[in-house]
Amino acid sequence: MRTEAQVPALQPPEPGLEGAMGHRTLVLPWVLLTLCVTAGTPEVWVQVRMEATELSSFTIRCGFLGSGSISLVTVSWGGPNGAGGTTLAVLHPERGIRQWAPARQARWETQSSISLILEGSGASSPCANTTFCCKFASFPEGSWEACGSLPPSSDPGLSAPPTPAPILRADLAGILGVSGVLLFGCVYLLHLLRRHKHRPAPRLQPSRTSPQAPRARAWAPSQASQAALHVPYATINTSCRPATLDTAHPHGGPSWWASLPTHAAHRPQGPAAWASTPIPARGSFVSVENGLYAQAGERPPHTGPGLTLFPDPRGPRAMEGPLGVR
């Protein structure tokens, strides 16, 4: 992927070309400024809490700090989903929620955060050193995952502080490349503005050099540098993850991937497919590792006026309060 940006000529402009050159000088900073403003790095936070009432009961809360539209959230334990982790719950904003034991209640707390309560009894109950991971699939940011666990010395009732610990994924390589381009653009914009401020008024004399202005090129990482970005998952071994759930979901991915609509999910690819998979353009981002967007351009439709069940800004917890007639 290559993007070319026209830069002003280094020599004074030719007579009659001053308007065109001035226009080009003005347009480029605005284009770059727009890119700078819209470029942001999303982050996932994970908070694990052991309930004081039930010592083996956990509440996991996860959130996505990004501007994109979340299309799927997967909560797993024992490591990242797809790398030995076992799926506990999957939350789809437009199709619903699916959970597996020992998950007791998965729910959306806000448009960008979820919570999951785990039961604390039986062979499948978690223990204090279990690692919990949350993966958020979002457009246009892609797939972001973070993991957290309860500190070994935690007292019951206390929670681990939210841990934004994103795991670099193969499907982020393209985004990182774009971020690099944008960063370069921002730096270049500052340089351009600074130079523009200090530049003396140009003399209107014909150019002695070629009329073709030199071009500055900004490009995405090469294949080699993209490959360098492909960091494998951090695999966490825990002593208390039940083997019974592993047989149910051997790869951490439930068996329903094929049943979801094409814009929601596909069965994940193995890490071997990473290096050979080209990084797509941001506009039609397709997740490399788990192919969550076949039609990434789709945005969730708006709900009709006055027909929402609970459009309460407090989220689903508003349900627990007194029910008013809408």
């Epitope: 904003p93 199709r95 699916r98 959970q99």
Partner: nanobody, 118 residues
Framework: EVQLVESGGGLVQPGGSLRLSCAAS????????MGWYRQAPGKDRELVAT???????KYVDSVKGRFTISRGDAKNSLSLQMNSLRAEDTAVYYC????????????WGQGTMVTVSS
């Protein structure tokens, strides 16, 4: 797209009973909130009762003690048992589903008519 299909409406005398049912096409995910709304002729649509997939239930005051909402054995099936029906319960009853509970995407059935008249 989640499809909701209601059934069970009809004509009943005051004090009688009816059972409305709603079946959702979504059979993999649990729909976080499902509920019943009604719209009487010439009036706005109003909430009757809701139930979350974890079993939390709410009723509007005017139907408390008379109506019972429940989720069936089949995934995402919903029913509304209506007892001690009154003339003011006459309306088109709509099944509603909010998969996330956030109102981001809400689905509606086509409605079933309930007429309470002697």
């Amino acid at each position: 797209e989640v499809q909701l299909v209601e059934s069970g409406g009809g004509l009943v005398q005051p004090g009688g009973s009816l059972r409305l049912s709603c079946a959702a096409s979504e059979t993999y995910f649990d729909l976080y909130v499902m509920g019943w709304y009604r719209q009487a002729p010439g009036k706005d649509r109003e909430l009757v009762a809701t139930i979350t997939y974890t079993g939390s239930i709410k009723y509007v005051d005017s139907v408390k003690g008379r109506f019972t909402i429940s989720r069936g054995d089949a995934k995402n099936s919903l029913s509304l048992q209506m007892n001690s029906l009154r003339a003011e319960d006459t309306a088109v009853y709509y099944c509603n589903a909010d998969p996330s509970g956030l109102g981001r995407k809400v689905y509606w059935g086509q409605g079933t008519m309930v007429t309470v008249s002697s």
